[in-house]
């Protein structure tokens, strides 16, 4: 049963990433561990978003949970044959993949451009800007640039460290979902088990 | 309307340290960041650093670590900076400016034995 | 450290003239430029940030451009009260370099 175990080890992985995408985005919401800055709405744009939240977390849930049950043995069949209904189930998990991929895509993209345009800081003249967004990223490469940025304490690193960590995990989550793509058209068509035996049956 | 009152004229010894203070009012003190820019006799400006007195965050111009010390105090409104180990090279009018909208008069540091 | 060359050193002009006054920077600042007015014996003022935002009160015929590595500030229409020195500071990144210095003087 490769394809099913292969589907329930990715399942399990989404559910730690979707948990730590989930956390990465509220963190986000408090700069230096302050509310201050949420209530007054003096968060990045994109935080806004919800991508950890929502693309990279809660609908990552949904197939996750799909995968997980894929290896279940108490599998109806069709037509008497077991794993008839096992492949189907199989097939279907590429539905629950692609809403993965949609969702992690969502989160890597929000990421990318959170990254991109940097923080909504005070700037050394008391404006409320997107301090490096005329630096199309270039700011990401020059830290001596980042103290331009005077409040919220230590606001540029904050930023940068969430949104990295939002971008690399919503980026192995769009990877896991592709593979169970590949897995789940692969266990659908050849059959739910490995044995060439086991294939003939259904 | 935006004050900045900066402490009288200091003539120090070389070697020693002075510590001037600039007492702002007509704003939230703590809302703006607080910039100390030098100007020796006749010459241009040069930033030394500034301060935020919300966070306490200093940033300073390499060349100033070590001379300069930021500090500010919450409760009575005012941003000070300390010169330590003073030269003739000191010898300046130092200006500390709000978000470098509004500015002190500046105090003027005469370093002479 | 970014240096910031400021030309002319000096400039003479006649009230009523248009001057502009240049400022190169030896990195690319973007448009982390301000522009700052002294008079003689007076705090500086600021003029002009982010390269083209007139600061709060500042007459209309000031006026800042560029971005990149070079930046001007134009007045136009000269009074009396614009004569003075000017610098230019870049606020890319730490520290914020100042400009030498424009001496505007009446001709």
């Known amino acids: 049963m490769c394809y099913g175990k292969c589907a329930r080890c990715i399942g399990h992985s989404l559910v730690g990433l979707a948990l730590l995408c989930i956390i990465a985005n509220i963190l986000l919401y408090f700069p230096n561990g302050e509310t201050k800055y949420a209530s007054e709405n003096h968060l990045s744009r994109f935080v806004w978003f919800f991508s950890g939240i929502v693309g990279g977390g809660l609908l990552m849930l949904l197939p996750a949970f799909v995968f997980i049950g894929l290896e279940q043995d108490d599998c109806c069949g069709c037509c008497g044959h077991e794993n008839c209904g096992k492949r189907c189930a199989m097939l279907s998990s590429v539905l629950a993949a692609l809403i993965g991929i949609a969702g992690s895509g969502y989160c890597v993209i929000v990421a990318a451009l959170g990254l991109a345009e940097g923080p909504l800081c005070l700037d050394s003249f008391g404006q409320w800007n997107y301090t490096f967004a005329s630096t199309e990223g270039q700011y990401l490469l020059d830290t001596s640039t980042w103290s331009q940025c005077t409040e919220p304490k230590h606001i540029v690193e904050w930023n940068v460290s969430l949104f990295s960590i939002l971008l690399a995990l919503g980026g192995i989550e769009f990877i896991l979902c592709l593979i169970q793509v590949i897995n789940g058209v692969l266990g659908g068509i050849c059959g739910f088990c490995c044995s060439r035996q086991q294939q003939y049956d259904c | 309307e935006v004050q900045l009152q900066q402490s009288g004229p200091e003539l120090v010894k070389p070697g020693a340290s002075v510590k001037m203070s600039c007492k702002a009012s007509?704003?939230?003190?703590?809302?703006?960041?607080m910039h100390w820019v030098k100007q020796k006799p006749g010459q241009g400006l040069e930033w030394i650093g500034y301060?935020?007195?919300?966070?306490?965050?200093?940033n300073y111009n390499e060349k100033f670590k070590g001379k300069a010390t930021l500090t500010s105090d919450r409760s009575s409104n005012t941003a000070y900076m300390e010169l330590s180990s003073l030269t003739s090279e000191d010898s300046a009018v130092y200006y500390c400016?709000?978000?470098?909208?509004?500015w002190g008069r500046g105090t003027l540091v005469t370093v002479s034995a | 450290d970014i240096q910031m060359t400021q030309s002319p050193a000096s400039l003479s002009a006649s009230v009523g003239e248009t001057v502009t006054i240049t400022c190169r920077a030896s990195?690319?600042?973007?448009?982390?430029l301000a522009w700052f007015q002294q008079k003689q014996g007076k705090s500086p003022q600021l003029l002009v940030y982010?390269?083209?935002t007139l600061a709060e009160g500042v007459p209309s015929r000031f006026s800042g451009g560029g971005s990149g590595t070079q930046f001007s500030l134009k007045i136009n229409s000269l009074q009396p009260a614009d004569f003075g020195s000017y610098y230019c500071?870049?606020?890319?990144?730490?520290?914020?370099?100042f400009g030498s210095g424009t001496k505007l003087e009446i001709k």
């Open positions: 400016a709000r978000n470098y909208f509004d």
């Open positions: 007509g704003y939230t003190f703590s809302s703006y960041v």
């Open positions: 301060i935020n007195p919300y966070s306490d965050v200093t």
């Open positions: 990195k690319n600042v973007y448009s982390y």
């Open positions: 982010n390269a083209k």
């Open positions: 500071q870049h606020h890319y990144n730490i520290p914020f370099t």
